[in-house]
């Protein structure tokens, strides 16, 4: 007999999601309009292509990357899409309200969709730590809280620290990782007896997870360059990200083999580490002047990622209840920090070179930005975790963790699909 969606959730989810969607439609009706200015089609197409790259990263890349569980692959992909669709809508409104609203209506441009997709990506990174342990109603709450927290963080950083879109969006890695880890910490941890097999990976879902990693790998240069303002900055960011992810792939595969007693390559390590370079150079991708530096960073990031994948899962599993194959949380927390530290090191080198106190002040500001991002991520993550523990969401029972049959209709009702 297949597990039925709990009756109360069947009543709660459609009502909650559709009410929210209706509210969003009303907000769009009253407060938004399209950018009506004249622009040539060629420029529009080029601008749209960047947004399209980001959407592919989010829907296919992150969707499939999280689909490696034996019994939870359908839910991983579809729930990611659901969160992306909802997150983009809310992020467009929120960014508009925070940045433009005093002037009247929120103007929607291709850039605002690009920005919103990146904000929604934050949720898809965070959710890796909790997928399989929450239902869609809970994920809706997570989307709303995280997108709101990230939007406000970016606005505060922009206003207080005087940083541009790229710099304040690149906190996304650290923010998303710590947000996801703190939510996971609040959720029920121990897997009951008899369900251990559900959080194991299987060959076909692992292959789809690798497909997700490949899509992310291909489009990571678009992500890192999407918010930069001039062709010279974007070109530099694309080159540096490409070199960094190229080196991190080589490092990931060889490092994974090195880390195994029999020299075998771990799928989990590779899924994660191929992206390491892209995350590590994110903040500084436009500032790095030569390929060799980007490649060194890719190498270091790949090694850190493999090392983290080897030693951190045990700790994460015990403390946070995160399964071994959900590696994005700790991976991005380490690599995001590495990326931020690299940027701070560049500022420190400026200080040493100039012997200038004001550049030292810039270093302090950057440390302040990073600290603020981590603090807001942890606080909003804990708040979300507490909210998700409320009984009204009818969270899946621990025995139903990592089980597609709780959420999906399978005509064959096979247990070992």
């Amino acid at each position: 007999m297949s597990s039925k969606y709990p009756r109360s959730v069947r009543r709660c989810l459609p009502l909650w999601a559709l009410t929210l969607e209706a509210a969003l439609i009303l907000l769009f009706y009253f407060f938004t309009h399209y950018d009506a200015s004249l622009e040539d089609q060629k420029g529009l197409v080029a601008s749209y292509q960047v947004g399209q790259d980001l959407t592919v990263m989010a829907a296919i890349g992150l969707g499939f990357l999280t689909s490696s569980f034996r019994r939870h692959s359908w839910s991983s992909v579809a729930f990611n899409l659901f969160m992306l669709a909802l997150g983009v809508q809310w992020a467009i409104l929120l960014d508009g309200f925070l940045s433009q609203f005093p002037s009247g209506k929120v103007v929607i441009t291709l850039f605002s969709i690009r920005l919103a997709t990146m904000s929604a990506l934050s949720v898809l990174i965070s959710v890796d730590a909790v997928l399989g342990k929450v239902n869609l109603a809970q994920l809706v709450v997570m989307v709303l809280v995280e997108v709101t927290a990230l939007g406000n963080l970016r606005m505060v950083i922009s206003n207080i620290f005087n940083t541009d879109y790229h710099m304040n969006m690149m906190h996304i890695y650290v923010f998303a990782a710590y947000f996801g880890l703190s939510v996971a910490w609040c959720l029920p941890k121990p897997l009951p007896e008899g369900t251990e097999d559900k959080d194991q990976t299987a060959t076909i879902p692992s292959l789809s997870a690798m497909l997700g990693a490949l899509f992310l790998w291909m489009f990571w240069p678009s992500f890192n360059s999407a918010l930069l303002r001039s062709p010279i900055e974007r070109k530099n960011a694309v080159f540096n990200t490409y070199y960094a992810v190229a080196v991190s792939v080589v490092t990931a595969i060889s490092g994974s083999s090195l880390a195994h007693p029999q020299g075998k390559i771990s799928k989990t390590y590779v899924h994660s580490a191929v992206l390491a370079g892209g995350v590590a150079v994110g903040t500084s991708c436009h500032l790095i002047p030569s390929p060799w530096l980007a490649m060194v960073l890719g190498l270091v990031a790949g090694l850190i990622s493999v090392g983290g994948a080897k030693y951190l899962p045990g700790c994460c599993n015990r403390v946070l209840g995160i399964p071994h194959s959900s590696i994005m949380g700790y991976n991005f927390s380490l690599l995001g920090l590495l990326g931020e530290i690299i940027y701070i090191v560049l500022l420190v080198l400026d200080t040493v070179g100039a012997g200038n106190g004001m550049i030292g002040f810039q270093v302090l500001l950057s440390i302040g930005e990073l600290s603020l991002a981590i603090v807001i991520a942890l606080m909003s993550g804990l708040l979300t975790g507490l909210l998700l523990n409320l009984k009204i969401w009818k969270a899946p029972h621990e025995a139903k963790y990592f089980d597609d049959q709780v959420f999906w209709k399978f005509p064959h009702l096979a247990v070992g699909f």
């Epitope: 622009e39 040539d40 420029g43 529009l44 080029a46 601008s47 960047v50 441009t109 291709l110 850039f111 690009r114 922009s158 206003n159 005087n162 940083t163 541009d164 879109y165 303002r229 001039s230 062709p231 010279i232 900055e233 530099n236 500084s284 436009h286 500032l287 790095i288 002047p289 030569s290 530096l293 560049l346 080198l349 400026d350 070179g353 004001m358 002040f361 810039q362 500001l365």
Partner: antibody, heavy 129, light 108 residues
């Protein structure tokens, strides 16, 4: 020769609209961000708006947000400023300016510079009843 | 929004003298994003200095810029008759631009 020529200025009543144009020549227009800057009679320079090289992003001074719209047509090498709900305080000479993005490098990092390196001669907008 | 305050408002000097114009920001500005412009009556502004200290193309070496953080200076080592004009500092930060109110350099 690199050149920017503004047009579309004139006398207009408060509350009405006006559209300024800026024709660019002598450089690859689609590679540069573009700005509008204004100068009220006897006053200093006031930045009005900027549009990125590909038209994907625009920023406005708080004093014009919601009333003015900057846009560009890269196929026509033209920059526009649509001014709605004009007020007496919008009376000024309006300049369009090219944004030059350049950089210098040390061994470990690049430094980017964004400056308005080429300016038009300006077009006068007078808002008066 | 960052406010730039220029001083003095008017500076009266003779040709051949050294002029020092100051620009103070209400909060720290990246040196990369600080520029100086010259404007003569009836003309459009002209870029002099960018990145706080780099001279624009075609600008004589008597013009120099310095400073970082919140305090920036434009120095004209030996004033020529054509240097008497209004000078503006300008910053870019968080995708917003602001100009100082200007310093008028006049012949004494």
């Amino acid at each position: 020769e690199v050149q920017l020529v503004e047009s579309g200025g004139g006398v207009v009543q408060p509350g009405r609209s006006l559209r300024l144009s800026c024709a660019a020549s002598g450089f690859t227009f689609s590679n540069h961000g573009m700005h509008w800057v204004r100068q009220a009679p006897g006053k200093g320079l006031e930045w009005v708006a900027v549009i990125w090289y590909d038209g994907s992003n625009k920023y406005y001074a708080d004093s014009v947000k919601g009333r003015f719209t900057i846009s560009r047509d890269n196929s026509k090498n033209t920059l526009y400023l649509q001014m709605n709900s004009l007020r007496a305080e919008d009376t000024a000479v309006y300049y369009c300016a090219r944004e030059m993005a350049s950089y210098s490098s040390s061994w470990y990092r690049r430094y980017y510079y964004y400056v308005m390196d080429v300016w038009g001669k300006g077009t006068t907008v007078t808002v008066s009843s | 929004e960052i406010v730039l305050t220029q001083s003095p408002g008017t500076l009266s000097l003779s040709p051949g003298e050294r002029a020092t114009l100051s620009c103070r920001a209400s909060q720290s500005v990246s040196s990369s994003y600080l520029a100086w412009y010259q404007q003569k009556p009836g003309q459009a502004p002209r870029l002099l200095i960018y990145g706080a200290s780099s001279r624009a193309t075609g600008i004589p070496d008597r013009f120099s810029g310095s400073g970082s953080g919140t305090d920036f200076t434009l120095t004209i080592s030996r004033l020529e008759p054509e240097d008497f004009a209004v000078y503006y500092c300008q910053q870019y930060g968080s995708s917003r631009y602001t100009f100082g109110q200007g310093t008028k350099l006049e012949i004494k």
